[in-house]
């Protein structure tokens, strides 16, 4: 069942799935100048059976410009470079996450996929909270979120989580290391990274390329 | 007591656009998403999409994506959908539910007729 | 997109008689939802995930089900049950109704 609300929002905090459950939709969303193709699903589905979880469909984009084509167009070398980062983020995702019985990874990269990812979470499903850096977290308990469901009615839990303005941020479970983080997040509208029940995510890759940035934020 | 309240039915030319409102009332407008469905005549109940007001994202159905465009307004606790390139087949009943989860309050539907 | 299939599509009844109206979707779903219609009015919520009735709704009516298969049960008519009936997915994208069952007097 979709969850048809959005994860609490948490000053100064992050969040992210360490795995998606079943049910979970990713949309199959292009960069700006590609559109999915014409015989395309809109989404990915998380899908399995009792021994496997996996994504249903496969995203593919084609050129804005090349109509009646399922022709995958050569990025140039600026979206190579793009595409090249964020092959590597999802092979690090991939590295940090568990398997969990009916949930499924990170899907991997798809060729011009959009700079954010916008999920659809299903009930059951947990977030995971985290201080953007230069904050740092008091916890009165789980740093985390649940869809449940009530009556019909979805909602997801409140995390115990409060981040105030000092030094280390905190960690995602099955994390050693801090996480890079930009400084402070965008506060303008149209800038403003992205996260809803339709989990919009926008990674990036720090400048030493070493560690893995995950900057989620409501619109 | 929560209430959502539709605009008046309209006739409209074909190729023209129309823009239906529901105006919210009795519970926190942002703390919802708001749905919208469309019935034709004689037929059955198809979900046309959805927009979350406290953001403005918007999910559509397919079917409906090049066709109607949901918008909201927090400040009026209104949310609206406008349908452009109208045709005959557009003709229906057009209501607004208040989501999340199942559909507990509907508005009392806008009929939208296309007629030349 | 997850079709829905209602059966049947027009029912003939008499106050009294036991209601049973199917639900089958084309793929498997977590749960089921129903509303009643009523003609020149908006639907109105009828049974919640599978088998919890709404607010107000009488005892009478009863859901149940899983997978791909569920049910709505009327156990014994009343004057104020006829109307159309509408199965309900939100399990995934986009949201689907079954095409309805229409409970008319025989």
């Known amino acids: 069942e979709l969850c048809d609300d959005d994860p609490p929002k948490i000053t100064h905090a992050t969040f992210k799935a360490v795995a998606y459950k079943e049910g979970t939709m990713l949309n199959c969303e292009c960069k700006r100048g590609f559109r999915r193709i014409k015989s395309g699903s809109p989404y990915m589905l998380c899908t399995g059976n009792s021994s496997h979880s996996s994504w249903d469909n496969q995203c593919q984009c084609t050129s804005s410009a090349a109509r009646n084509t399922t022709k995958q167009v050569t990025p140039q070398p600026e979206e190579q470079k793009e595409r090249k980062t964020t092959e590597m983020q999802s092979q690090m995702q991939l590295a940090d996450q568990v398997s969990l019985p009916g949930h499924c990874r990170e899907p991997p990269p798809w060729e011009n996929e959009a700079t954010e990812r916008i999920y659809h979470f299903v009930v059951g499903q947990t977030v995971y909270y985290q201080c953007v850096q230069g904050y740092r977290a008091l916890h009165r308990g789980p740093a985390e979120s649940v869809c449940k469901m009530t009556h019909g009615k979805t909602r997801w839990t409140q995390p115990q989580l409060i981040c105030t303005g000092e030094t280390e941020p905190s960690q995602f479970p099955g994390e050693e290391e801090p996480q890079a983080s930009p400084d402070g997040l965008p506060e303008s509208e149209t800038s403003r990274l992205v996260t809803t029940t339709d989990f919009r995510i926008q990674t990036e890759v720090a400048a030493t390329m070493e560690t893995f940035i995950f900057t989620t934020e409501y619109q | 007591q929560v209430q959502l309240v539709q605009s008046g039915a309209e006739v409209k030319k074909p190729g023209s656009s129309v823009k239906v409102s529901c105006k919210a009332s009795g519970y926190t407008f942002t703390s919802y998403r708001m749905h919208w469905v469309r019935q034709a005549p004689g037929q059955g109940l198809e979900w046309m999409g959805y927009?979350?007001?406290?953001?403005?994202?918007?999910e559509y159905n397919q079917k409906f994506k090049d066709k109607a465009t949901i918008t909201a307004d927090e400040s009026t606790n209104t949310a609206y959908m406008e349908l452009s390139s109208l045709r005959s087949e557009d003709t229906a009943v057009y209501y607004c539910?208040?989501?999340?989860?199942?559909?507990?309050?509907w508005g009392q539907g806008t009929l939208v007729t296309v007629s030349s | 997109d997850i079709q829905m299939t209602q059966s049947p599509s027009t029912l003939s009844a008499s106050v009294g008689d036991r209601v049973t109206i199917t639900c089958s979707a084309s793929s498997s779903i977590s749960y089921m939802h129903w509303y009643q219609q009523k003609p020149g009015k908006a639907p109105k919520l009828l049974i919640y995930?599978?088998?919890n009735l709404a607010s107000g709704v009488p005892a009478r009516f009863s859901g149940s089900g899983s997978g791909t298969e569920f049910t709505l049960t009327i156990s014994s008519l009343q004057p104020d049950d006829f109307a159309t009936y509408y199965c309900h997915q939100r399990s995934t994208y986009p949201l689907t109704f079954g095409q309805g069952t229409k409970v008319e007097v025989k």
């Open positions: 995930t599978t088998s």
């Open positions: 539910a208040r989501g999340g989860g199942v559909f507990d309050y």
């Open positions: 927009i979350n007001p406290s953001t403005g994202y918007t």
